[in-house]
Interface confidence: medium
């Protein structure tokens, strides 16, 4: 994670900056979401647990054509140490619970929040 | 010391414009969201505006959308905020606030002593 | 936009006395709620973060509880630096919203 690439700046991107950035673009899509974020597409929940960066990318890449989370699939697959790709499935997917978009965003957001004041960066 | 100073307020008239500033210091700025917080004499406090730690994201109460612009300089530590189109209402004393990441954590730790802005003819 | 509210507004007190101030949000704010404390020509002053957490510095006799959308500042034993206006803050969503505060004075 100490070599993350930033987004405003380009080389490596402190492991606290780059939650930082992720849990600002969770807040602005929360904030600017005025119709059903992604067309209230579903994905699959994750157990928010160690390894849940990879799991979340896992769930929001089957997401396609949502420009709206774009910039948070970019940014998880920075927190991702293996290449995801669409249909990929890790255990800490609750298989049969899907939830919206929108739900899954404020779930994660809620839980960054968490580590971020824990100083739980990695 | 953490600090911050705000500056730039004074008399101005209606519609006129004012740019106030609020220099940080002892504290890495560019790790930090900031505010600007308004309090008007006698009232409660007010919200004005957000800054992300790069410029990304940027937000406004509705009483002033439109008319202030909040910017900053993290090579100069330093937050602004462009008033413009001002009204009587915008009468107040101007506080810029630290916070740790918008919407999300301990928001305001640290304030400056504020800068009193007065509207009038 | 979250409304905040604050109860009482005001209250009388002696030098020594516990006192509580509430604050409720309009909608569930989670715990990003902050307490801080303003003496007349001041900047306000940080006292409960995240709901529970003092803020480094501040005496044990505050303390703060509550989540979602009720929450509660306590002093437990008032002191004569205390008299002061006490404002809560939401900052769970934009546009940040602080309540309308309440002014403890001496009785």
């Known amino acids: 994670l100490t070599c993350l690439g930033g987004f405003a700046s380009p080389g490596p991107v402190p492991p606290s900056t780059a939650l930082r950035e992720l849990i600002e673009e969770l807040v602005n899509i929360t904030q600017n979401q005025k119709a059903p974020l992604c067309n209230g597409s579903m994905v699959w929940s994750i157990n928010l647990t160690a390894g849940m960066y990879c799991a979340a990318l896992e769930s929001l890449i089957n997401v396609s054509g949502c420009s709206a989370i774009e910039k948070t699939q970019r940014m998880l697959s920075g927190f991702c140490p293996h290449k995801v790709s669409a249909g990929q499935f890790s255990s800490l997917h609750v298989r049969d619970t899907k939830i919206e978009v929108a739900q899954f965003v404020k779930d994660l957001l809620l839980h960054l929040k968490k580590l971020f004041r824990e100083g739980q960066f990695n | 010391e953490v600090q911050l100073v705000e500056s730039g307020g004074g008399l101005v008239k209606p519609g006129g414009s004012l740019r106030l500033s609020c220099a940080a210091s002892g504290f890495t700025f560019s790790s930090y969201s900031m505010n600007w917080v308004r309090q008007a004499p006698g009232k409660g406090l007010e919200w004005v505006s957000y800054i992300s730690t790069s410029n990304s994201y940027i937000y406004y109460a509705d009483s002033v959308k439109g008319r202030f612009t909040i910017s900053r300089d993290n090579a100069k530590n330093s937050l602004y905020l462009q008033m413009n189109s001002l009204r009587a209402e915008d009468t107040a004393v101007y506080y810029c606030a630290r916070d740790q990441v918008g919407a999300t954590l301990d928001a305001f730790d640290i304030w400056g002593q504020g800068t009193m802005v007065t509207v009038s003819s | 936009d979250i409304q905040m509210t604050q109860s009482p507004s005001s209250l009388s007190a002696s030098v020594g006395d516990r006192v509580t101030f509430t604050c409720r949000a309009s909608?569930?704010?989670?715990?990003?709620l902050g307490w801080y404390q303003q003496k007349p020509g001041k900047a306000p002053k940080r006292l409960i973060y995240a709901a529970s957490s003092l803020q480094s510095g501040v005496p044990p006799r505050f303390s703060g509880s509550g989540s979602g959308t009720e929450f509660t500042l306590t002093i437990s034993s008032l002191q004569p630096e205390d008299f002061a206006t006490y404002y809560c803050?939401?900052?769970?969503?934009?546009?940040?919203?602080f309540g309308p505060g309440t002014k403890v004075d001496i009785r």
């Open positions: 803050l939401q900052h769970n969503s934009y546009p940040f919203t």
């Open positions: 909608q569930d704010i989670t715990d990003d």
